[in-house]
């Protein structure tokens, strides 16, 4: 019962996590214009992994895709790669874990096969979650570095007559979605690995039985020899399953065209 619950919960948590990783990867708000200590501009800039956007105070938003591969920073390419690997591994993990679920019967699949599949999907979820967390963290590190560089430029470049608005970027919503989603996928993977241990058939019970005389009573009576054996029948616990209903909340609510700066 506990094993099934752990497996089912691990699957649901991983599913939510992977949905979050996909959402984060697709989101445009990986970095957003820093408004603190800045003149109030009537234009708000934000950037994603695939395109950069500008929202004017008029409400109009214009997004431009990065239509080049060679011209993009290596770090951005690395973040893209990590997120995509995370999604692919997660998707495969979900597919494998569906067949590994104890509450789903497929032909005459043995528990050992289900245990192996559960472990495989668990490892995939863990790697997927780590990829997402790594990707988001690399991007965040890139932002922090650029933020302080542009802050330094802001205060060193004040000598000229003409002032320019230095656009600094800070953490966007996608980073937080990515971190949380990666964490959930990781937790789901760990739960699947834990569930795997409970699913594995206890073969050791048969292989490592020690035959010794302790617990056997041997009595010599005039009526002849009587020996009572102390081996009981090896019975397995019958498992019960519960298929609980789970709801998945929306991971990201996008700003309306009337969010103004």
């Amino acid at each position: 019962m506990a094993v099934t619950a752990c497996q089912g919960l691990g699957f649901v948590v991983s599913l939510i996590g992977i949905a979050g990783i996909i959402a984060a990867t697709c989101m445009d708000q990986w970095s957003t214009q820093d408004l603190y200590n800045n003149p109030v501009t009537a234009v708000f800039n934000y950037q994603g992994l695939w395109r950069s956007c500008v929202r004017e105070s008029s409400g109009f938003t214009e997004c431009r895709g990065y239509f080049t591969l060679l011209g993009l920073p290596a770090m951005l390419q690395a973040v893209r790669a990590l997120m995509i690997v995370g999604i692919v591994l997660g998707a495969i993990g979900l597919l494998v874990s569906i067949f590994a679920l104890k509450c789903i019967r497929i032909g005459s699949m043995e528990d050992s096969a289900k245990a192996n599949m559960t472990l495989t999907s668990g490892i995939m979820f863990i790697v997927s979650g780590l990829c997402a967390i790594a990707g988001v963290s690399v991007f965040a590190n890139m932002l922090v570095t650029n933020f302080w560089m542009s802050t330094a430029n802001m205060y060193t470049g004040m000598g000229g007559m003409v002032q320019t608005v230095q656009t600094r970027y800070t953490f966007g919503a996608a980073l937080f979605v990515g971190w949380v989603a990666g964490g959930l996928t990781l937790i789901g993977g760990v739960m699947m690995c834990i569930a795997c241990r409970g699913l594995a058939p206890e073969e050791t019970n048969y292989k490592a039985v020690s035959y010794h005389a302790s617990g056997h009573s041997v009595a010599y009576k005039p009526g002849g020899f009587k020996a009572s054996t102390g081996f009981g029948s090896n019975t397995k616990n019958k498992k019960t399953y519960d298929g609980g209903a789970h709801t998945e909340d929306e991971l990201q609510s996008y700003p309306s065209k009337h969010d103004y700066v």
Epitope: V43, S52, S58, H258
Partner: antibody, heavy 118, light 113 residues
Amino acid sequence: EVQLQQSGPELVKPGASVKMSCKASGYTFTNYIIHWVKQKPGQGLEWIGYINPYTDGPKYNEKFKGRATLTSDKSSSTAYMEFSSLTSEDSAVYYCARLNRGNAMDYWGQGTSVTVSS
Amino acid sequence: DIVMTQSPSSLTVTVREKVTLSCKSSQSLLNSGNQKNYLTWYQQKPGQPPKLLIYWASTRESGVPDRFTGSGSGTDFTLTISSVQAEDLAVYYCQNVYIYPFTFGAGTKLELK
């Protein structure tokens, strides 16, 4: 056809208040911000502020903050500007304008003339 | 606040003459996010509200004759009328629409010789 119809001329006494309207037609009122601009006789243009009809959120030029109040009414597709504690310096034509792509004011009302005189 | 400086304050021209109006801002109006300059040009005739001519410093509003051309970037902008017509006699204003408060230049008055 997009139109911004402003209320008629006003003659007010110093210290009084005036409330002018700007009725929008020919487009979805809540999709565009309405800006207000002041023009003194024979002089240039001065930005007062804007009202976002979708959120009813205003933004003001610091110079006019506290004296100008911008509101809107979705049901009648009308934006309002109330000006208080009027002085002779406030005698001007007040325009409402719709903000479009590029933060450009593409359609303007015909203007409301306000004369402050005792 | 951003200061918009227009020059000259008035200009006397003849019909079919080429005219260049200048506008300078105290801060750059170039947005790094989309590489667009948030400057607009308006034309105002006596007794009328201003009319939008150019936005994004160089994009002509629909219905505006192609003799009107906007150019420039950062802090220096120009409005060029390639061949002035009698109906072009008006006051021309440039406006900062990048940083609040939005500010207008004092205007350039175009007069007929």
